[in-house]
């Protein structure tokens, strides 16, 4: 049988494929024996297609994203699901099929000129739609490679840091994301006390550069919790 390892943890107890040894064309290996459809049945295979367990979008195929198969289902169980076509509902870019991105909860076309216009539009829109953020989830590789032929310079619209030139990262700016400089020694940085709190930032900073970490500035130790200043300092 095939054993899949995610971050060095084997997904154990995979049943043998139909008809024998792992790897024979047409064979199917059941991935997550405990996952149920909303109706209570185990996954039905279509042409021996077996869902692939995942932890992030990048592990899936180019036309898939990683999510829990049932709305409000067990958050611990995620599989690769078919991407959403244009005008379908979405919560992040990776949910939309290649050539589209998620805007205000709907998959819209991301052809180059159209995409740039859409991004500029989103900056002027009122904040408050749960789905309007261009969040920090992993982005579809084909989307970014389609849109950016050269690495983005400072201020260029981006989807992820790999879209930006060396020394820059992709960070939120209003409701779009642009390439910003990676922070240098002594520059103010953001230390997130709560996991996921970076999602609330409208003006997101880059991370500290190599050999630096974001720590409380020495002379600010006495200050109150809310006003403590963090800067990039040598390890």
């Amino acid at each position: 049988t095939l054993n899949s390892v995610l971050n060095s943890n084997a997904i154990k107890n995979l049943p043998p494929p139909l008809g024998g040894a792992a790897g024979h064309p047409g064979s199917a290996v059941s991935a997550a024996p405990g996952i149920l459809y909303p109706g209570g049945n185990k996954y039905q295979t279509i042409d021996n297609y077996q869902p692939y367990p995942c932890a992030e979008d990048e592990e899936c195929g180019t036309d898939e994203y990683c999510a829990s198969p049932t709305r409000g289902g067990d958050a611990g169980v995620q599989i690769c699901l078919a991407c959403r076509k244009r005008r379908k509902r979405c919560m992040r870019h990776a949910m939309c099929c290649p050539g589209n991105y998620c805007k205000n909860g709907i998959c819209v076309s991301s052809d180059q000129n159209h995409f740039r216009g859409e991004i500029e539009e989103t900056i002027t829109e009122s904040f408050g739609n749960d789905h309007s953020t261009l969040d920090g989830y992993s982005r579809r590789t084909t989307l970014s490679s389609k849109m950016y032929h050269t690495k983005g310079q400072e201020g260029s619209v981006c989807l992820r840091s790999s879209d930006c030139a060396s020394g820059l990262c992709c960070a939120r700016h209003f409701w779009s994301k642009i390439c910003k400089p990676v922070l240098k020694e002594g520059q103010v940085c953001t230390k997130h006390r709560r996991k996921g709190s970076h999602g609330l930032e409208i003006f997101q900073r880059c991370y500290c550069g190599e050999g630096l970490s974001c720590r409380i500035q020495k002379d600010h130790h006495q200050a109150s919790n809310s006003s403590r200043l963090h800067t990039c300092q040598r390890h």
């Epitope: 095939l2 899949s4 390892v5 995610l6 971050n7 060095s8 995979l14 494929p17 792992a22 790897g23 024979h24 064309p25 064979s27 199917a28 290996v29 059941s30 991935a31 021996n48 297609y49 077996q50 869902p51 692939y52 367990p53 932890a55 992030e56 990048e58 592990e59 899936c60 195929g61 180019t62 036309d63 898939e64 690769c80 078919a82 590789t141």
Partner: nanobody, 129 residues
Framework: EVQLMESGGGLVQAGGSLTLSCTAS????????MGWFRQAPGKEREFVAA????????HYADSVLGRFTISRDNAKNTVLLQMSSLKPEDTAVYYC??????????????????????WGQGTQVTVSS
Amino acid sequence: EVQLMESGGGLVQAGGSLTLSCTASGRTFDNYAMGWFRQAPGKEREFVAAISWSLSRTHYADSVLGRFTISRDNAKNTVLLQMSSLKPEDTAVYYCAAAPRPKRISVSYFSTSSNYDYWGQGTQVTVSS
């Protein structure tokens, strides 16, 4: 021209270790899964291990789980297969292969040889008892 070149094979005693290396040239393989297959004389080619385009994900055949470790370095376009606690039954020609990231993925994708577009020439591993 795309080429996969294996190296590191050889003769080793049972219980010993070897590290196979596969170097890709002619294109970048960062959006490909890289896998190792092996073929013993008179037997079918079988899946050994694979590592996806997403570096966190590795896959192993039952027979090598816990003994073999696959890793990759996209910057150097190389894939390594570290083999320890080798057994005589590991004797085979080991092939490196590359499979493109598909539109849809299933559990058997990585272990299915027909999904791999590029193959190396192979390197012989012989484990003596």
